[in-house]
């Protein structure tokens, strides 16, 4: 028989999302407007187009990344779609409230949205340490907490060190991994004896979490260059980070059979790994002046991913909880963690050049960033993830992680899907 | 040749609205940021506002945020200034200007640099009860 | 976004040189290499003359220099014409998309 959702889940869930629904809706209708400008129909659509690359990445693409799990691929999926939705929402009004409030309403512009969606995918990414083990009424707190950290640490890095659009969103990949490894860290982590197996990967969801994979491969272009803010920053940053995601995508498969005893090439490394370029590259992809400058980070960040993947999990396994395929939280913490230190070593590197005293205060300043993004991370995934731990939320008991068929309706009951 | 040309100042009374506007010509107007500058009598320049190349993005001077907007219509050439809520301080000669992006680099990294490289001849705003 | 401090008026005579400073009170200039001077004749429009600090755009004559030191960026014309007889402004990235000017320096040719 089917395992149900607790009856108090089935009254909380709907009210809760609900109710904070109508409270967004409402929101909504007090405090923003549309852009009135006037905008040229084909400069409305190539700016849509960014944002449309944007939310394929993160509904489908990180949506199907997160889906290898044996019995709960359905729920990673959709879970993912729910987050985002709300995510969204809850990112445009807090970005206005932050950044245009004083003068009046939230003024909404395809460009917010864009923002917006960067700010969602940041729980997309953090979630999959935590997916799994919580329902939908504790996803909802966690979107809610992360966006919120997320928005008001870019307003401050922008407000106190002056960083702009691209430089303050890139940290999402750091903040996103931090923020997921500290959740983690607080939920429940034994797993029964016999439900080891829910959390094993199955290859009909493996095939969609590669195509996941595909997807997020295809259109980190677009994400890495969405928020600069010239046609030439846009491009070289574009270029930049095909070449990288490119050769990490050989790296990837290639060190993947490198690291197997029998030479043999690991789902869950190549998964992760053809993306390593692309994050490694995000900082400093409208910087890097050559191809073979961004084709060496890739193959570096691939190396590293490979390597995270292949000696990390035990140990996020034992200490987080984490499961081994839920490889997004350790690869994306060590490969943002690159991208910021590419970035400081290019100020170095200038500083060496120039002898300039003030490039040496960015170094200081971009060193302070990345800390504060890192502190700010762990210290709102921790209250997140003791928020997530109150018994109102009635999380799923760990006999029931990993299982689709304690959220989902399936009228064939079938066991192995 | 490349020109900006500002229209549309005149007399008007505080608290009352203008639109300024600056057609573009001679470049490929979609490609470039756009700013608008002023320069009150006997004052230095101020910067007003600028407008990303697509229109996706808009930033504005704490003097007149939340009043006045910037927009384009990248498909007629045209930049826009609407100011509601005029003040005696906005008196001022308005000039567009636009953001050219250039670049050197050194084997390891790429230095963007932002110049006001176009001007028009400015258009004069008074704001006067 | 207080405007970057410039001497209300240097003149000098026909060869002569001369400096214009152009000084922030906070780290606008120190922070960026975005400073660039524009030369402003009456009833015109301004025209760039020094780029990215110390840059000249083609077409500008070679006795117009940029320098920066730590918060103070200058303009040094040296060789003064007549047709120097302008109003010199900087102009300094301020950060997040915004920009600074100076307060504006008007120069004499005697």
């Known amino acids: 028989m089917s395992s149900k959702y607790p009856r108090s889940v089935r009254r909380c869930l709907p009210l809760w999302a609900l109710t904070l629904e109508a409270a967004l809706i409402l929101l909504f209708y007090f405090f923003t407007h549309y852009d009135a400008s006037l905008e040229d129909q084909k400069g409305l659509v190539a700016s849509y187009q960014v944002g449309q690359d944007l939310t394929v990445m993160a509904a489908i693409g990180l949506g199907f990344l997160t889906s290898s799990f044996r019995r709960h691929s359905w729920s990673s999926v959709a879970f993912n779609l729910f987050m985002l939705a709300l995510g969204v929402q809850w990112a445009i009004l807090l970005d206005g409230f932050l950044s245009q409030f004083p003068s009046g309403k939230v003024v909404i512009t395809l460009f917010s949205i864009r923002l917006a969606t960067m700010s969602a995918l940041s729980v997309l990414i953090s979630v999959d340490a935590v997916l799994g083990k919580v329902n939908l009424a504790q996803l909802v707190v966690m979107v809610l907490v992360e966006v919120t950290a997320l928005g008001n640490l870019r307003m401050v890095i922008s407000n106190i060190f002056n960083t702009d659009y691209h430089m303050n969103m890139m940290h999402i990949y750091v903040f996103a991994a931090y923020f997921g490894l500290s959740v983690a860290w607080c939920l429940p982590k034994p797993l029964p004896e016999g439900t080891e197996d829910k959390d094993q990967t199955a290859t009909i969801p493996s095939l969609s979490a590669m195509l996941g994979a595909l997807f997020l491969w295809m259109f980190w272009p677009s994400f890495n260059s969405a928020l600069l803010r010239s046609p030439i920053e846009r491009k070289n940053a574009v270029f930049n980070t095909y070449y990288a995601v490119a050769v990490s995508v050989v790296t990837a498969i290639s060190g993947s059979s490198l690291a197997h005893p029998q030479g043999k090439i690991s789902k869950t490394y190549v998964h992760s790994a053809v993306l390593a370029g692309g994050v490694a590259v995000g900082t400093s992809c409208h910087l890097i002046p050559s191809p073979w400058l961004a084709m060496v980070l890739g193959l570096v960040a691939g190396l590293i991913s490979v390597g995270g993947a292949k000696y990390l999990p035990g140990c996020c396994n034992r200490v987080l909880g984490i499961p081994h395929s839920s490889i997004m939280g350790y690869n994306f913490s060590l490969l943002g963690l690159l991208g910021e230190i590419i970035y400081i070593v290019l100020l170095v590197l200038d500083t060496v050049g120039a002898g300039n005293g003030m490039i040496g205060f960015q170094v200081l300043l971009s060193i302070g960033e990345l800390s504060l993004a890192i502190v700010i991370a762990l210290m709102s995934g921790l209250l997140t993830g003791l928020l997530l731990n109150l018994k109102i939320w009635k999380a799923p008991h760990e006999a029931k992680y990993f299982d689709d068929q304690v959220f989902w309706k399936f009228p064939h009951l079938a066991v192995g899907f | 040749e490349v020109q900006l040309v500002e229209s549309g100042g005149g007399v008007v009374q505080p608290g009352r609205s203008l639109r300024l506007s600056c057609a573009a010509s001679g470049f490929t107007f979609s490609n470039y940021g756009m700013h608008w500058v002023r320069q009150a009598p006997g004052k230095g320049l101020e910067w007003v506002a600028v407008?990303?190349?697509?229109?996706?993005?808009?930033y504005y001077a704490d003097s007149v945020k939340g009043r006045f907007t910037i927009s384009r219509d990248n498909s007629k050439n045209t930049l826009y200034l609407q100011m509601n809520s005029l003040r005696a301080e906005d008196t001022a000669v308005y000039y567009c200007?636009?953001?050219?992006?250039?670049?050197?680099?050194?084997?390891?990294?790429?230095?963007?640099?932002?110049?006001?490289?176009?001007w028009g001849k400015g258009t004069t705003v008074t704001v006067s009860s | 976004q207080s405007a970057l401090t410039q001497p209300a008026s240097v003149s000098g005579s026909p060869g002569q040189s001369i400096t214009i400073s152009c000084t922030a009170t906070s780290s606008d200039i120190g922070a960026y290499n975005y400073v660039s001077w524009y030369q402003h004749h009456p009833g015109k429009a301004p025209k760039v003359i020094i780029t990215d600090v110390n840059k000249r755009p083609s077409g500008v004559p070679d006795r117009f220099s940029g320098s920066k030191s730590g918060n103070t960026a200058s303009l040094t014309i040296s060789g003064l014409q007549p047709e120097d007889e302008a109003e010199y402004s900087c102009?300094?990235?301020?950060?997040?998309?915004?920009?600074?000017f100076g307060t504006g320096t008007k120069v004499t040719v005697l």
């Open positions: 200007a636009r953001e050219m992006v250039s670049y050197s680099s050194s084997w390891y990294r790429r230095y963007y640099y932002y110049v006001m490289d176009v």
């Open positions: 407008i990303w190349y697509d229109g996706s993005n808009k």
């Open positions: 102009c300094s990235y301020a950060g997040t998309y915004s920009y600074v």
